[in-house]
Interface confidence: medium
């Protein structure tokens, strides 16, 4: 069986799949996923291995019409290091010189200047190219190569080993070299995998079985850090509690080098925030930090000075915590604004079971803002996903130069922000450079400000705008309005009528469904409509709501359904990646990110059109 | 490399008790499970009594409720109490520990202390 890093090369225009027959004969053979032969795998950025002979594809030297054999993987050759180029074509690094089938006297596969269909290869059995299946780092863990990452293959005992192995050892741990040749250089670590015993490498707290692993003797970058612990299906510690940071403060006392976690600002337009989207509440820095740098946008622990926190420069090289297991933010569920009946006074804005309303020209401080909209029988709003968020911005009519009151303060309990109604905190948006929680100025309070409607610690006594937000009360069946411009069950936004398609279809249905509807699969024209969109799908149970972006006309070029530019984009992390595919909304935590999807996958979606009387613009010229 | 150093063996009367220590030190991680063994004669060398990082046991049948094996993380050390001793458990004990060290291999032995059950 093949494992989801191995793949067969095949030639489309012959049909066949390239074959190492022996280290010195790689020809091509009818495809057999069967055959070790013809299995290969990516064990760099550049080289590729046999898996039979765990040597790697080279060639003796850069020049057109030479034999492309095996040869001991070595990650310094430049006769090793092969790039995908545009499409298929697979060749040298820095050459024009491509990997060809050879010919009918040439039973070889060769290097050759000729990028024609000889030269074309693809994974079997997929459209995708040799890159589509590339390399991930693997970092390890303990050992005494302070957590550098594998190399595959790695020589232990004059044996090679291309994945991670327990030789050498009765207790099934698994590890790998990190260089080459072991048995000259001595260089190992454990591999980040799930194996018999390694859950002794992470630390329990019995009190909320969160389980915390300290990577002390690692020197890591953050993103490699990151990197790491994801890849032990975990992220870089955050901490939202009180009792969590003195249980790390227990967990490390016995360490003096700092230590990554997953703070950051590395959102170009948003303040502090957590890699594993836990939100920002709760702050323990170092007297002196966040210092405002450029550049120092990650942070790390410091056992040393009490496990206070200072942000460094993501390129350093430290030790990190990795945090997986239970979270304490799923407890508090949201409702989702299709399940709730909102009925609101007048001048009250409805969403998701409850009523808003922004307060911009009685201008108060936080505690009378606070007084007030006790009064109307809410309190200062809360805010707990980015859809809740997104519908505040784009539906009640919030401006760009707004400065108003939340409900959020650490009032209470200094360094440790808590909404005024007393429901969790389960999500924040900072401004970039916020919280900046500056003790000479006692900023204890939160606004909403900024075209995004970002948040940003304030002094309580400043006379502000601020916002309600109240219960609804529900009052018998739901009468639905029909919007004006947009016919029953659409909803309007600006211009246009949207429509949730509520049957499970594939992009091309969902497509042929909308264009029945005299509509067509949505586009997404800027974060305004975005904004919009979010709120419309985000807080729904289905996980994803098809768009009209695809790559299918053209691969890696993603266009809309109709003839439209795109002028916005707003891709989930490692998105679009080389994923050829149909794009979709992502709802949940991931609220109204891109993801590509295989375009045959089932997904509910979204319908557009021009509401009835409106005027469309002119088509700006380019 | 990681060394072994088992101690508190000697010549005890039929009926009696004793306690092994074997200590553990060098380029460990952490430790995964640290027992005792002694020669046996179909095998070169039978398990007696092992315990993991987390405190799990096993004990060989023949030494079950007389003998009782404990550990102190923080020391690296593995300890054996032996109650109710009788002369065929005369043997060299010898401490092994499989750990997770800073090199690949896991399996290290002691080397050995002689307890002697006689009148």
């Known amino acids: 069986l093949l494992d989801t890093r191995q793949f067969l090369i095949y030639n489309e225009d012959h049909k066949r799949c390239v074959d190492a027959v022996s280290p010195s004969a790689v020809q091509t053979a009818a495809c057999n996923q069967d055959a070790e032969s013809q299995k290969f795998r990516w064990v760099s950025e550049s080289q590729i291995m046999s898996v039979a002979f765990k040597l790697c594809l080279g060639v003796p030297s850069k020049t057109d019409w030479v034999a492309i054999t095996l040869y001991a993987c070595d990650s310094k050759s430049e006769f090793q290091k092969w790039e995908c180029k545009n499409d298929t074509l697979l060749g040298i690094k820095g050459e024009d010189l491509f990997f060809n089938y050879g010919n009918r006297q040439e039973k070889n596969i060769m290097l050759y200047k000729g990028s024609g269909l000889w030269s074309r290869w693809k994974i079997y059995g997929t459209t995708d190219n040799l890159c589509s299946r590339g390399y991930e780092a693997m970092y390890t863990l303990l050992g005494n190569a302070n957590g550098a990452t594998c190399a595959f293959p790695f020589k232990f005992e004059n044996k090679w080993y291309a994945d991670c192995t327990s030789a050498g050892r009765s207790d099934g741990w698994l590890w790998c070299g990190t260089t080459t040749d072991y048995d000259t250089d001595k260089l190992f670590g454990y591999c980040p995998l799930k194996f018999e015993g390694s859950e002794s490498l992470w630390n329990k707290d019995p009190l909320t079985s969160v389980s915390y692993q300290i990577n002390s003797k690692s020197a890591l970058t953050w993103h490699q850090a990151r990197k790491s612990c994801q890849q032990q299906n975990a992220e870089l510690l955050s901490i939202t509690e009180i009792h969590e940071q003195t249980y790390l403060t227990g967990l490390t006392s016995s360490l003096t080098s700092g230590l990554w976690i997953g703070l950051n600002s590395l959102s170009f337009n948003s303040g502090w925030q957590w890699s594993d989207r836990s939100p920002f509440r709760y702050l323990n820095w170092l007297p002196g930090s966040p210092s405002a740098e450029p550049g120092k946008s990650c942070v790390s622990l410091n056992p040393g000075k009490n496990a206070k926190w200072e942000n460094l420069e993501c390129v350093q090289k430290l030790g990190y915590i990795c945090k997986k297991g239970n979270t304490t933010l799923n407890s508090f569920v949201i409702p989702s604004e299709s399940d709730v009946p909102t009925h609101c006074p007048s001048q009250w804005w409805p969403y998701a079971g409850h009523c808003y309303k922004i307060h911009r020209d009685e201008k108060k401080i936080q505690r009378d803002a606070l007084t007030t909209c006790r009064k109307e029988g809410g309190d200062l709003t809360s805010i707990h996903t980015i859809e809740e968020l997104d519908f505040i911005i784009s539906q009640l009519g919030y401006e760009p130069n707004d400065e108003l009151w939340i409900g959020l303060n650490d009032i209470k309990i200094q360094m440790y922000f808590e909404w005024s109604d007393g429901t969790p905190v389960t999500f924040t948006k900072w401004l970039r450079g916020e919280p900046s929680h500056e003790n000479n100025r006692q900023e204890d309070c939160v606004v909403m400000k900024g075209k995004d409607g970002y948040w940003a610690d304030r002094g309580c006594e400043w006379p502000l705008g601020y916002i309600c937000k109240m219960k609804s009360r529900s009052q018998g069946p739901e009468i639905v309005e029909v919007e004006k411009g947009c016919r029953k069950g659409w909803k309007k936004h600006h211009f246009y009528c949207y429509m949730i398609g509520h049957t499970l279809s594939t992009f091309a249905e969902a497509n042929q469904t909308c264009n029945n509807e005299n509509a067509y699969l949505t586009t997404i024209e800027d974060r305004y409509e975005q904004a919009f969109l979010t709120s419309f799908v985000g807080l729904r149970p289905e996980k994803y709501f098809w768009t009209g972006l695809s790559d299918i006309q053209t691969k890696g070029t993603f266009q809309w359904t109709i003839e439209e530019e795109v002028r916005f984009t707003h891709w989930n992390s490692d998105m679009p990646g080389r994923k050829p595919g149909c794009v979709a909304m992502r709802t949940g935590i991931a609220g109204g990110l891109w993801d590509v999807l295989k375009c045959d996958e089932k997904a509910k979606f979204v319908c557009k059109h021009w509401a009835e009387g409106v005027t469309h613009p002119p088509k700006p010229t380019t | 490399y990681v060394q072994l150093a088992e101690s508190g063996g000697g010549l005890v009367q039929p009926g009696g008790s004793l306690i092994l220590s074997c200590a553990a030190s060098g380029s460990i991680c952490t430790s995964n499970a640290m027992g005792w063994y002694r020669p046996a004669l179909w095998k070169q060398r039978e398990e007696v009594a092992d315990i993991t990082s987390g405190g799990s046991t096993n004990y060989a049948d023949s030494v079950k409720g007389r003998f009782t094996i404990s550990r102190d993380n923080a020391k690296n050390t593995v300890y054996l109490q032996m109650n109710s001793l009788k002369p065929k458990v005369t043997a060299v004990y010898y401490c092994?520990?499989?750990?997770?060290?800073?090199?690949?291999?896991?399996?290290?032995w002691g080397q050995g202390t002689l307890v002697t059950v006689s009148s």
């Open positions: 092994k520990a499989v750990v997770v060290t800073t090199t690949p291999y896991s399996d290290y």
